[in-house]
Interface confidence: medium
């Protein structure tokens, strides 16, 4: 619970395919075996029709077909659940594994893949039984694919829930340099490993990776509380040498205007090894893509304990300045920059139009009004909804609700 | 779970040195950062030193030339002196953790240390 | 070093009533204060951290709010239980002082 970010931890409420909070009209698909099977009787623990979506075509070898769910607002989707055909308990139709897709837009679809790359999910054994699957990382999405896999030409059938909550923070992308490598007696890996956007000459562009998915780095940069994972995992760094302007620039692109109080910078300094919290931040403001920078930087000295190693959250007042994109510079004040989460607080400015195509309606579960005084942004939970625990261990792991 | 205990002599002559140790379980001394805090009878609370998980420590520079800390990792204890005691070093003495928070979020039952002749 | 006037220095309530405990740094902290409460014979709880988060498994009745010098803790709706000093310290810088307490009485 970094200040000013949200605890994954909290965000796993359903999102509505169960309680029909999501309508028919936001669910479709690639193709429907039959009316019965439409896309709208993909509802977990539905009986509707013959008791869930299944596709017209056979998912092997091809595995084009697809289920989709439209969130209609960026949510943070930490979890899915998914089930095979009911048909009265007489559907015999699942699906063994599955993979899935996602857009924030629209237009730029992803594929998700778990911390070492694996894209396949492993599925249902049988109709009936619910299988959750923690995602990590989570997915910022507002349209969800679900595409059925099969190791063989049969047919597949597919009843869903997503979990999560509603991606308060805004941030769409943020662009950065390529994180690097720290050598000390063992390669300390500090690249964003789950940057969903473009990589080209060395800058990471158009997606969100580690940097906004709630996970907060140790003191100790080389250590990780995700299981099995590198050395660096939770941090994303850059060296001083490589940067003769004596800082790291980067950019952060919103869903609309907003009005921006505070940034808030997970940060390491472990100054043993290298890691030292900036010197200075700097941030600039524009309203559109193609507009000028507006005003004069915000500048932010950063004082405090420099002896003092604990990794921490660092606060830069933003003065509540409106923009869309904020482009901001952090100096280096010593050989490392290690940052491991970046959030801001902010609020919406009233009447600015969504960025992504069409309007979003509010989405009528989740209370009005701006974040709570203790900044967490994703933390509002819908009403009359309990989070659906965690599970100890792996954040990967399925278990199942028979 | 995670516990800290701290063990004390009770009570110490004036001039006389303090040792205290806080012998801590559930977790490791080398991921963790081990403060002091006193607390005189009826009054507040008054931070002392650290010493982080990497072995380098902060004193309260009030109390630096009196002052020692160290730690056994492999023994998961950590070992207060504090030298030249007086009356008004009369209180109880916690030891608390800090992790991933920034802030103390485990202490010690605390050890009562009474300075008297 | 960085001084931490609290106050008031004492609180007489009753059950149910809103309190709200004020720190004033000296200079500075950014946000890096942290509220603690002291039961009677107890030693301290973390309550709040980073001036505004609030510590797993404390209730949403305590908040805290501020930045810069000034602070504030909230109790929305103060229960029996309730009953101890609170103390705010700065995690900004060493020393980390921390502010005279208040001690909350219930009626």
């Known amino acids: 619970d970094m200040k000013g970010h949200f605890d994954p931890a909290k965000c796993r409420y359903a999102l509505g395919m169960q309680d029909r909070t999501i309508p028919d009209s936001d669910i479709s698909a690639s193709s429907s075996w039959s009316d019965s099977t439409a896309a709208r009787h993909s509802r977990l623990e539905s009986s509707d029709g013959d008791g869930a979506w299944c596709p017209a075509g056979s998912v092997f070898p091809k595995e084009e077909e697809y289920l989709q769910v439209d969130l209609q607002r960026l949510h943070l989707v930490a979890l899915v659940g998914t089930q095979g055909r009911h048909a009265g308990g007489l559907g015999k139709e699942f699906s063994r594994s599955y993979r899935l897709r996602y857009s924030r837009d629209g237009r730029r679809w992803m594929g998700w893949k778990d911390r070492w790359g694996q894209e396949v999910i492993s599925g249902n054994e049988d109709p009936e039984g619910v299988v959750l699957k923690d995602l990590g990382p989570p997915m910022v999405a507002r349209l969800v694919r679900f595409y059925p896999r099969a190791d063989r030409v049969m047919s597949v059938c597919l009843r869903v829930e997503l979990y999560g909550c509603l991606w308060r923070d805004g941030l769409l992308s943020y662009t950065a340099p390529v994180g690097q490598t720290m050598y000390l007696s063992e390669a300390v890996y500090l690249n964003d490993s789950t940057y969903d956007g473009h990589t080209v000459g060395g800058l990471q562009y158009g997606g969100l990776g580690q940097l906004a998915d709630g996970v907060v780095g140790l003191d100790d940069f080389r250590k990780s509380q995700e299981l099995r994972v590198w050395p660096g995992y939770d941090y994303v760094g850059w060296s001083n040498h490589s940067f003769s302007s004596g800082y790291v620039e980067m950019e952060f692109e919103f869903d609309r205007l907003r009005a921006f109080q505070a940034m808030q910078v997970h940060c390491n300094n472990m100054h043993t090894l290298g890691a030292r919290l900036p010197g200075g931040v700097e941030c600039r403001f524009r309203r559109g893509p193609a507009m000028a920078w507006e005003g004069e930087p915000m500048r932010h000295n950063l004082g405090g304990n420099l002896g003092d190693p604990r990794a921490r959250a660092v606060s830069v007042p933003l003065g509540g300045r409106v923009a869309r994109f904020l482009q901001c510079r952090f100096l280096f004040a010593g050989p490392w920059l290690l940052f491991s989460e970046i959030s801001f607080i902010s609020d919406v400015v009233n009447n600015s139009s969504p960025a992504l195509g069409g309007t979003f309606p509010p989405a009528p579960w989740w209370p009005p009004g701006p974040p709570p005084t203790n900044f967490s942004s994703l933390e509002l939970e819908p009403r009359g909804q309990q989070p659906v625990a965690k599970a100890e261990g792996s954040p990967t792991i399925e278990f199942r609700m028979d | 779970q995670v516990q800290l205990k701290e063990s004390g002599p009770g009570l110490v002559a004036p001039s006389q040195s303090l040792s205290i140790t806080c012998t801590v379980s559930?977790?490791?001394?080398?991921?963790?950062?081990i403060h002091w805090v006193r607390q005189p009878p009826g009054k507040g609370l008054e931070w002392l030193v650290v010493?982080?998980?990497?072995?380098?420590?902060t004193y309260n520079s009030a109390l630096k030339s009196r002052l020692s800390i160290s730690k056994d990792n492999s023994k998961s204890q950590v070992f207060l002196k504090m030298n030249s005691l007086q009356t008004d070093d009369t209180a109880i003495y916690y030891c608390?953790?800090?992790?991933?928070?920034?802030?103390?979020?485990?202490w010690g039952q605390g050890t009562s240390v009474t300075v008297s002749s | 070093s960085i001084v931490m006037t609290q106050t008031p220095k004492f609180l007489l309530v009753s059950a149910g009533d809103r309190v709200t405990i004020t720190c004033k740094a000296s200079?500075?902290?950014?946000?890096?204060v942290v509220w603690y409460q002291q039961k009677p014979g107890q030693s301290p709880k973390l309550l709040i951290y980073?001036?505004?988060s609030r510590y797993t498994g404390v209730p949403d009745r305590f908040t805290g709010s501020g930045y810069g010098t000034d602070f504030t803790f909230t109790i929305s709706t103060v229960q029996a239980e309730d009953l101890a000093v609170y103390f705010c310290?700065?995690?900004?810088?060493?020393?980390?002082?921390f502010g005279g307490g208040t001690k909350l009485e219930i009626r």
């Open positions: 608390a953790r800090t992790g991933n928070f920034y802030a103390m979020d485990y």
């Open positions: 310290q700065q995690d900004y810088s060493s020393p980390y002082t």
């Open positions: 200079q500075s902290v950014s946000n890096d």
């Open positions: 559930g977790f490791s001394l080398t991921s963790y950062h």
């Open positions: 980073y001036a505004s």
């Open positions: 010493i982080w998980s990497d072995g380098s420590t």
